[in-house]
């Protein structure tokens, strides 16, 4: 299945974080979502074959990239308290 790391992370305000996702083998598309406690998931990015294919309602301090092996990183800079959330990765063909 899809694997993410790290599973838990504690950061202080203003710091930067990098989250990693490995898709299901053979999947070329990776999507990232943010789920704040008590709310539904909010779409952040979709990447397909290393190109950004979709962009959610987040400013540019949220960035992502996809590597040649189709794994992906999500970076969040200048962290705010409101960034505290569950970050989900999904993959598809």
């Amino acid at each position: 299945g899809v694997t993410q790391s790290p599973t838990h992370l504690i950061k202080t305000r203003g710091q930067q974080v990098t989250l990693r996702c490995s898709p299901i083998s053979g999947h070329k598309s990776v999507s990232w979502y943010q789920q704040v406690l008590g709310q539904g998931p909010q779409f952040i990015f979709q990447y397909y074959e290393k190109e950004e294919r979709g962009r959610g309602n987040f400013p540019d301090r949220f960035s992502a990239r996809q590597f040649p092996n189709y794994s992906s990183e999500l970076n969040v800079n200048a962290l705010l308290l409101g960034d505290s959330a569950l970050y989900l990765c999904a993959s598809s063909l």
Epitope: G54, P59, D60
Partner: antibody
């Protein structure tokens, strides 16, 4: 070519509301974020907010929450901004502007709609 | 909110000379190797026009006389050489965080 055609000037009374439009052509309207920007006479630029026409998702500058409401009609490729409880400080030129492909910059702008609030 | 301070507020440059406009952000606007600062030109009675995106990338159709540089909090728009058609107000804009903000503008005149 990509174009954003805005509605004409509006003269409205204090306390009234107004809805201005921005009709897009030449690109995939539903999948491109639309932004709105305010410019008071002789002043600088203020970002009001953005809308994703595909699903209506919005984000507002806190300064304009309760003042501006953004909507979009996919069938006509038109974005709208409703301004309520108008006062003299709302007299301005309002621009719609499309998000660029590589970040939240604005690569195509409408010509602007002048809103004048006067009794 | 991120505050963008432009300087000078106005400048007069002779034709053929170099014009330099500064934009300073109240905090870094860099993320993952990109600087999310953009530059626009606005001529009287017209909407703004994108010149430079992500600090140093020239928008399609914009003359190479325009260039941008800088990172983190300090950014510069350079016009070299200045032409008569460049008379306008220039704005910087950050998209690093919400709400997006603009600088107060720099008015360029010909000496």
């Amino acid at each position: 070519q990509v174009q954003l055609q805005q509605s004409g000037p509006e003269l409205v009374k204090p306390g009234a509301s107004v809805k201005i439009s921005c009709k897009a052509s030449g690109y995939a309207f539903s999948s491109s974020w639309m932004n709105w920007v305010k410019q008071r006479p002789g002043q600088g630029l203020e970002w009001i907010g953005r809308i994703y026409p595909g699903d209506g998702d919005t984000k507002y500058n806190g300064k304009f929450k309760g003042k501006a409401t953004l909507t979009a009609d996919k069938s006509s490729s038109t974005a709208y901004m409703h301004l309520s409880s108008l006062t003299s400080v709302d007299s301005a030129v309002y621009f719609c502007a499309r998000r660029g492909t590589g970040g939240w910059y604005f690569d195509v702008w409408g010509a602007g709609t002048t809103v004048t609030v006067s009794s | 909110d991120i505050v963008l301070t432009q300087s000078p507020a106005s400048l007069a440059v002779s034709l053929g000379q170099r014009a330099t406009i500064s934009c300073r952000a109240s905090e870094s606007v860099d993320s993952s190797g990109n600087s999310f600062m953009h530059w626009y030109q606005q001529k009287p009675g017209q909407p703004p026009q994108l010149l430079i995106y992500r600090a140093s990338n020239l928008e399609s159709g914009i003359p190479a006389r325009f260039s941008g540089s800088g990172s983190r909090t300090d950014f510069t728009l350079t016009i070299n050489p200045v032409e008569a058609d460049d008379v306008a107000t220039f704005y910087c804009q950050q998209s690093f965080d919400d709400p997006f903000t603009f600088g107060s503008g720099t008015k360029l005149e010909i000496k």
